[in-house]
């Protein structure tokens, strides 16, 4: 028998690589049974993940999985940084992993950069 | 069920390109990590790297980074790795494999491998 | 990178004995999300490596429960409590926590 328990399906240490000035949508997906969840996203500052309040969200419908969606309108490069998205489930919290966003500035790119690149420049995220 | 299936040229010339593909079946890639990784004759595995084909992000070996290149086909349900500047180092049998999802993240499907020479 | 260290380099034992191979990572492999992805692997000659064990101690499916996986941090373990003809194979250890993935250098078992 298949779980009825919520699950938020962000891939463990995924990235994304983006550029400053464009629309982007950072998806969580988010596997349920019956009720949705109330889902919110946060910004992870450090070890502490601070709530994103204000934003722009949607959800999108699929067959077998729903996504909430966290919309950039667009990409700044304080957007730079890693983001959780999260459940509330029977009173309980659940978690996903966190995904990175690495902004380029496009003002400050030259030419733009390979998506290992960016991911093998993590203090990136610090700047 | 899950298949993953490496294929390519078993002969390589040396200072040439290295070419596989690895055709998957029973899953979609865009679900998941497809990784490389080689073992020279009577030798240890050597992870080569892997991408994430949802978006093309790639993480490579420090070791072999200057040299190889993981792309994806999402509407093949396939992956590619070249690599670049070969030497009779790099003969090897290549894998693909799966990194499953939540909750494990962990390599749980292998393709056969394919043995790849280089040699003149 | 972290280096993942595998002992023995081989082992030789009779049937029904039990055989112990140790991983030692060069740092810990506890990830920020609580788990630890270690992983044990077992290979077979002219065979791709099958997973046997995954986070640290979870037996995949079909895999005997004479395996066992323990440990923390950076030590880690697996057991096989009665060694059968069928477990000749390399075993390595393998981390999935910090990039770039490494193996261990792979421990040989063998029958006496």
């Known amino acids: 028998k298949e779980s009825c328990d919520v699950q938020l399906y962000i891939k463990r240490q995924s990235y994304h690589s983006i550029f400053a000035g464009d629309p982007f949508k950072l998806e969580c997906p988010v596997k349920y049974c019956a009720h949705r969840p109330q889902v919110t996203w946060c910004k992870l500052n450090g070890t502490t993940c601070v709530k994103l309040e204000g934003r722009h969200t949607s959800w999108k419908q699929e067959k077998n999985l729903s996504f909430f969606i966290l919309h950039f309108e667009p990409v700044l490069p304080s957007d730079n940084g890693s983001y959780r998205c999260s459940a509330n489930f029977l009173s309980a919290i659940i978690e996903s992993h966190s995904t990175t966003l690495y902004v380029t500035d496009v003002k400050s790119a030259s030419e733009r950069p390979s998506k290992d690149e960016m991911a093998s420049r993590p203090w990136l995220l610090y700047s | 069920q899950v298949q993953l299936q490496e294929s390519g040229p078993g002969l390589v010339k040396p200072s040439g390109t290295l070419s596989l593909t690895c055709a998957d079946s029973?899953?979609?890639?865009?679900?998941?990590?497809i990784h490389w990784v080689r073992q020279p004759p009577g030798k240890g595995l050597e992870w080569i790297g892997r991408i994430d084909p949802a978006n093309g992000f790639t993480r490579y070996n420090p070791s072999l980074k200057s040299r190889v290149t993981i792309s994806s086909d999402k509407s093949k349900n396939q992956a590619s790795l070249k690599l670049s500047s070969v030497t009779a180092a790099d003969t090897a049998v290549y894998y693909c494999?799966?990194?499953?999802?939540?909750?494990?993240?962990?390599?749980?499907?292998w393709g056969q491998g394919t043995t790849v020479t280089v040699s003149s | 990178d972290i280096v993942m260290t595998q002992s023995p380099d081989s082992l030789a034992l009779s049937l029904g004995e039990r055989a112990t191979i140790n991983c030692k990572s060069s740092q810990s492999l506890l990830d920020v999300d609580g788990k630890t992805y270690l992983n044990w692997f077992q290979q077979k000659p002219g065979q791709p490596p099958k997973r046997l064990i995954y986070l640290v101690s979870k037996l995949d499916s079909g895999v005997p429960d004479r395996f066992s996986g323990s440990g923390s941090g950076t030590d880690f373990t697996l057991t096989i409590s009665s060694v059968q003809a069928e477990d000749v194979a390399v075993y390595y250890c393998?981390?999935?926590?910090?990039?770039?993935?490494?193996f261990g250098q792979g421990t040989k078992l063998e029958i006496k």
């Open positions: 393998w981390q999935g926590t910090h990039f770039p993935r490494t």
């Open positions: 494999a799966r990194e499953d999802g939540y909750p494990y993240y962990t390599l749980d499907a």
């Open positions: 029973g899953f979609s890639i865009s679900d998941t990590y």
